[in-house]
Amino acid sequence: ADPGQDRTDLLNVCMDAKHHKTKPGPEDKLHDQCSPWKKNACCTASTSQELHKDTSRLYNFNWDHCGKMEPACKRHFIQDTCLYECSPNLGPWIQQVNQSWRKERFLDVPLCKEDCQRWWEDCHTSHTCKSNWHRGWDWTSGVNKCPAGALCRTFESYFPTPAALCEGLWSHSYKVSNYSRGSGRCIQMWFDSAQGNPNEEVARFYAAAMHVNAGEMLHHHHHH
């Protein structure tokens, strides 16, 4: 299943999930780390404010489940959430899912290798108790807690490499790209919006590649 197989509209789209707008558009008051998406966003100002809070009401997810997460680490998780909630440029990687809280997810978004490396470097001394944060938590209190028998250890114990963090954390929502920031071939979690959103070009490139592949598939079936 190629990414984006479930959609024909791959550009300038919002995912069908818990807090996303139905269509992207300007949001002048996006908060702090989400502000780069002001000109065109899938998140509202209130979502952007809420996701900066510890244990925000968006998902009741506690970053500090193994003691206080280092601020240098936490900023990457906030940025990751901004990208997830706000980006209108991830259409090529949207997949349909049958989950109670969302109908779509991202799969294998090609994250620029430097963004992954820096995320891992800034977090490997913080602590966690799990290598996949989508499943297996104890939610009985309404907030994620470490399940019985899951020991709090350094991130490096659970995510020994940058790829283990970026690809394993959210069940392969990201894959680590071979490309670098500024190449136009990988998604940047961090960017300066003064130069525009570099992820627009990336989405256009992969959407075009997917249309070519789809065309080849049709051509192949027609002749066989």
């Epitope: 992954c116 114990s157 490499t161 940058p162």
Partner: antibody
Framework: EVQLVQSGAEVKKPGASVKVSCKAS????????MHWVRQAPGQRLEWMGW????????KYSQKFQGRVTITRDTSASTAYMELSSLRSEDTAVYYC???????????WGQGTLVTVSS | SSELTQDPAVSVALGQTVRITCQGD??????ANWYQQKPGQAPVLVIY???NLPSGIPDRFSGSSSGNTASLTITGAQAADEADYYC???????????FGGGTKLTVLG
Amino acid sequence: EVQLVQSGAEVKKPGASVKVSCKASGYTFTIYAMHWVRQAPGQRLEWMGWINAGNGNTKYSQKFQGRVTITRDTSASTAYMELSSLRSEDTAVYYCARDISYGSFDYWGQGTLVTVSS
Amino acid sequence: SSELTQDPAVSVALGQTVRITCQGDSLRSNYANWYQQKPGQAPVLVIYGQFNLPSGIPDRFSGSSSGNTASLTITGAQAADEADYYCDSRVSTGNHVVFGGGTKLTVLG
């Protein structure tokens, strides 16, 4: 294009050691872990251990602890697996495999046959 | 225990649906991955992270999980699907990996 190319077949005597190499290309070597898996003739896949290509940390299966050493040379984007005190039961095909996150091996080497015979 | 248990052999009629299972305690908290291996070849990843399909793998392959059991389903089995199938999973304690014993799939007809 991601590729893992392993060294050629080896024939060894019992008690000797063997060192198999795995040259990676087409990706940033230090961002991933490299694992080693073996398969004796007609048998199941058997996990041996892995190395964090970034910092060199290793973890070994208890079965091979003390006999296996996994190393890497980042300048050559190459991982190595050395198995010592060889016995006939170590006759197998040895594979290196790139790990995207704890056991998801998306690329494998072509395999290296190691034959242990007196 | 860190064992993963698979049925040694399963057969399916050409074009029919077959399910291969993998059972083990580690699957309660970790996703399974599935590999296809044909004689004389290296394994090929066909499902990762429980249900994700690598590019190039036909979408007749799918993965699912319930409790301590992971399943690989092939809908409309083809002759080319005849192979050995292995599951694997991370073992949380000690960051080890364990493989199942493998299932030999025969496609009849």
